[in-house]
């Protein structure tokens, strides 16, 4: 009758931070000699626990190994980290000088389940304009096992990524994912969101989401119109300059009279549209009795540090 080392579980999965028990039982108390636990095989194997007086942080024996009849050499590993992943072997030695390895268990593979970090979505450094194609990147790291699903959505519609990569490609303690998607901007996107959704075995069917608000990545330039209202009195003309459907809010409006600055507006009361864009109306009262000749009035709109948009209007002299 030869001693057998029984490791009943081929594999165990444990969430990072939790503890796990690796079971090992022997069929014999003989021959006399120590039992040791190793991770890995061959020369590079690492001693995890020895049923002696040595102290091993985070690893404890499950049963009282000092009891003469004890055949249970299971261990508990607490506060498991992704670095603890690997195959663990319970090994029986025969006492001698040196001790001789006589039997090993079949091994128990420990899979450490580590949650992916909340996905982070990044977009272009500069705002894009409608009809422009812009790329968004989603990154999540620190997860294990390697299997992971990443999906992109824009306003509820799934988008197909340009590429998705999980690194490293080989076996590792934890993994990272990076995915890039291309979005064609349109003028209605101020209220739109691009969502990166990550699903993993550790997340209990509640995927993690990273969100990019397109309002941070889009510029909608205003449509600028100057109109003349019916005169309220014989010697007064009302000019209106309307900047419509622009985003973001940053707007400067200047009135010029024959090319000379007449008034500087820093808009405060913007009107917000349902699509998230803004409108602004500036009124300019012209005293027509002061003008014998035709006067060219210019409304100059500077939006979000872009080149000025100018619209001219001629008021005929009296």
């Amino acid at each position: 009758t030869e001693v057998k080392v029984i490791q009943p579980e081929k594999s165990v999965s444990v969430a990072a931070g939790d503890s796990t028990v690796l079971n090992c039982t022997l069929t014999s108390l003989l021959p006399v000699g120590p039992i040791r636990w190793y991770r890995g095989v061959g020369q590079s194997r690492q001693l995890i626990y020895s049923f002696t007086t040595e102290h091993f942080p985070r690893v404890t024996n499950v049963s009282d190994a000092t009891k003469r009849s004890n055949l249970d050499f299971s261990i508990r590993i607490s506060n498991v980290t992704p670095e603890d992943a690997g195959t663990y072997y319970c090994v029986k030695f025969q006492r001698g000088s040196p001790d001789t390895e006589i039997q090993s268990g079949g091994g128990t593979e420990v899979y450490v389940l580590a949650k992916p970090s909340p996905p982070e979505v990044s977009g272009p450094a500069d705002r894009g304009i409608p009809d422009q194609k812009v790329n968004f990147t989603c990154k999540s790291h620190g997860f294990s096992p390697r299997n992971i699903t990443l999906k992109w959505f824009k306003d509820g519609q799934e988008l197909h990524p340009l590429e998705t990569t999980v690194n490293p490609s080989g076996k590792n303690v934890s993994y990272n994912i990076s995915s890039t998607v291309r979005v064609v901007l349109n003028s209605m996107d101020v209220n739109s969101k691009v969502i990166c959704e990550v699903a993993h075995i550790t997340l209990d069917r509640s995927p993690l989401r990273g969100i990019a608000n397109l309002s941070n990545f889009i510029r909608v330039s205003p449509t600028v119109k100057v109109t003349q209202q019916s005169p309220t009195s014989m010697n007064q003309v009302n000019l209106t300059c309307r900047a419509e459907r622009f985003y973001p809010e940053d707007l400067q409006l200047i009135w010029l009279e024959n090319g000379n600055v007449s008034r500087n507006d820093t808009p405060k009361n913007l009107t917000k549209n349902t699509d998230g864009t803004y409108n602004y109306t500036s009124l300019f009262l012209v005293n027509s009795s002061a003008h014998r000749e035709d006067v060219v009035f210019t409304c100059q709109v500077k939006h979000d540090q872009q080149p000025a948009i100018t619209r001219n209007h001629t008021v005929l002299g009296f």
Epitope: T1, V21, S28, V62, R68, N70
Partner: antibody
């Protein structure tokens, strides 16, 4: 002082499953480093170890019976149980439950329960 | 499985006699051996553990010795209440196995 008491039907029909329970009093089944065993004794014969459950979890079975035996524990009721399936007349015996002591011997035994397999 | 061979299978001795029972293991079991006494209609009772250690409360006329494959159980002075069957049991290897028993009677 720990005491053990076996309970279960005294008569089982061939091919059926024999089910016995051992109730532990005077101590907790989940404390200390003990084996809780089932042993049987055929009429006029010697003792045969069926199997044991160790306090830390492992269950050990006699290979000659392993395919038919299940030993389990219910810590909430302070009981451990034996199930022996597909019984025949050869399973007629007195069935004992026992507890291993602080040392290695079985120092506490139930009084035994006779199980007869007959149609 | 480890075979435990007990001899004799039965013996008859007078009160006060020294009684010796032997138990032989089919392979080395070190000192992983226990001895039990079973009286008719009763459950076994532990007398000796680890080959030579007397269980608490057991009279000192009972003793055990041996190591490896050969073990001896001795009653130094047989008493009428010692009428019983005695079993050796090894726990070095699974499955644990018992000897066939030695029935002790009074002449």
């Amino acid at each position: 002082q720990v005491q053990l008491q076996e309970s279960g039907p005294g008569l089982v029909k061939p091919s059926q499953t024999l089910s016995l329970t051992c109730t532990v009093s005077g101590g907790s089944i989940s404390s200390g480093g003990y084996y809780w065993s089932w042993i049987r004794q055929h009429p006029g014969k010697g003792l045969e170890w069926i199997g044991a459950i160790y306090y830390s979890g492992p269950i050990y079975y006699n290979p000659s019976l392993k395919s038919r035996v299940t030993i389990s524990v219910d810590t909430s009721k302070n009981q451990f149980s034996l199930k022996l399936s597909s019984v025949t007349a050869a399973d007629t015996a007195v069935y004992y439950c026992s507890k291993e002591g602080y040392h290695s011997g079985m120092d506490v035994w139930g009084q035994g329960t006779t199980v007869t397999v007959s149609s | 499985d480890i075979q435990m061979t007990q001899s004799p299978s039965s013996l008859s001795a007078s009160v006060g006699d020294r009684v010796t029972i032997t138990c032989q293991a089919s392979q080395d079991i070190s000192d992983y051996l226990n001895w039990y006494q079973q009286k008719p209609g009763k459950a076994p009772k532990l007398l000796i553990y680890d080959a030579d250690n007397l269980e608490t409360g057991v009279p000192s006329r009972f003793s055990g010795s041996g190591s490896g494959t050969d073990f001896t159980f001795t009653i130094s002075s047989l008493q009428p209440e010692d009428i019983a069957t005695y079993y050796c049991q090894q726990f070095a290897y699974l499955p644990w196995t018992f000897g066939g028993g030695t029935k002790v009677e009074i002449k």
